[in-house]
Amino acid sequence: VPRWRQQWSGPGTTKRFPETVLARCVKYTEIHPEMRHVDCQSVWDAFKGAFISKHPCNITEEDYQPLMKLGTQTVPCNKILLWSRIKDLAHQFTQVQRDMFTLEDTLLGYLADDLTWCGEFNTSKINYQSCPDWRKDCSNNPVSVFWKTVSRRFAEAACDVVHVMLNGSRSKIFDKNSTFGSVEVHNLQPEKVQTLEAWVIHGGREDSRDLCQDPTIKELESIISKRNIQFSCKNIYRPDKFLQCVKNPEDSSCTSEI
């Protein structure tokens, strides 16, 4: 008789999750010499230990502390790029602008990017059938708590000028409920961070509006200003040209506004 299993509303753990995390860890530590000291088996053990045998709606940041310790990494604090609802372009940008880092360019972000995972209370099994959905089931699930934890730490580490890439095609360009809006904004340290510079990425070819005047951007400016951090905003009208000019800044067409 099959054992009763909790049915959650979200997709189950990504198939081959343990193998994927371990393989990503090995690959990352091979590519990044400063992380060669990392013991990937210990990293996997700590990752697994954060959620295995625990109720998937009762995960805490404490559960992830061993993983955080083992994955501790120093990135240049003045080269941090945050993003909201525009991950692909942010990653394309840091692949070209190699001295800037998104969270997914760090070991822990790289390990978990695009993966889903959860366990079951009191069993050592990984649940490949379903995992809790943040809205429909619970917010304290393994994936949400992981991203909340690493995002908080990433924002806390930032200094000087912090950049954030925002999606100008969305109805809420700045969304208070996004990870950026609910976690990262509130964990930037005013004593270290001088300015938050938003890059609003336009979607339409002929979109010449100044999206920096959008009400949600004004809301972001208000939140940031109240935290004693300066705010600036730039429209990126042509993201394709923007990336091209990052690759070839000496190109003559790159002197005009992008």
Epitope: V38, S42, D45, K48, E62, L70
Partner: antibody, heavy 120, light 111 residues
Framework: EVQLLESGGGLVQPGGSLRLSCPAS????????MTWVRQAPGKGLEWVST????????WYADSVRGRFTISRDNSKNTLYLQMNSLRAEDTAVYYC???????????????WGQGTTVTV | QSALTQPPSASGTPGQRVTISCSGS????????VSWYQQLPGTAPKLLIY???QRPSGVPDRFSGSKSGTSASLAISGLQSEDEADYYC????????????FGGGTKLTVL
């Protein structure tokens, strides 16, 4: 019976060296992180250093970093603390403690040795 | 000076309930599990509470732990003379190179 038994303490001149040992018995030593904690006379507990189950990663208190080295030999079920450039302020009882298991269902120091005294 | 702040002393009469506080910050207690240790005179420390609230087997249920935000506390109910000891809280620190931090310790006297 789960047991930790420190040895290697003694009287040493400032600038000198000592190596503490802590053999473990009664549990799977290679499945636990291990930690050294010290206690100066009449003072509180002070964390010194921690090493992971595999020995692949270690952390040190600011007060000992660069002078002390934690290591382990899982084949001998033994934890070590090599102490160089010793100072008067390193005088203390040194305890070894079993720390986080590699299942990570808790992090705390749940088994302690009886301590060994280092006098500088 | 310890990263975690405990009152240096506490006292109570047999049968009473005593609480010992442990105050930290967002870089330690807030996001890490707290553990509590009892050290009887002349002996090694002993684990009383782990993961904020859990008791190891063999520890009487008179001992209980709690945590809220950047503070934690240890409660001892039905105080007994053998509870006279030093009590320490400990947690992990989020700093890059460190790991454990301890409170300065609280000397509990049973009157």
């Amino acid at each position: 019976e789960v047991q930790l038994l420190e040895s290697g303490g003694g009287l040493v001149q400032p600038g000198g060296s000592l190596r503490l040992s802590c053999p473990a018995s009664g549990f799977d030593f290679s499945s636990y992180w291990m930690t050294w904690v010290r206690q100066a006379p009449g003072k509180g507990l002070e964390w010194v250093s921690t090493i992971t189950d595999s020995g692949g990663r270690a952390w040190y208190a600011d007060s000992v970093r660069g002078r002390f080295t934690i290591s382990r030999d899982n084949s001998k079920n033994t934890l070590y603390l090599q102490m160089n450039s010793l100072r008067a302020e390193d005088t203390a009882v040194y305890y070894c403690a079993r720390d986080t298991p590699k299942t990570y269902y808790y992090y705390a120091m749940d088994v302690w040795g009886q301590g060994t005294t280092v006098t500088v | 000076q310890s990263a975690l702040t405990q009152p240096p002393s506490a006292s109570g009469t047999p049968g009473q309930r005593v609480t010992i506080s442990c105050s930290g910050s967002s870089s330690n207690i807030q996001y890490s599990y707290v553990s509590w240790y009892q050290q009887l005179p002349g002996t090694a420390p002993k684990l009383l509470i782990y993961n904020n609230v859990q008791r190891p087997s063999g520890v009487p249920d008179r001992f209980s732990g709690s945590k809220s935000g950047t503070s934690a506390s240890l409660a001892i109910s039905g105080l007994q003379s053998e509870d006279e000891a030093d009590y320490y809280c400990a947690t992990w620190d989020e700093s890059l190179l460190g790991l454990w931090v301890f409170g300065g310790g609280t000397k509990l006297t049973v009157l």
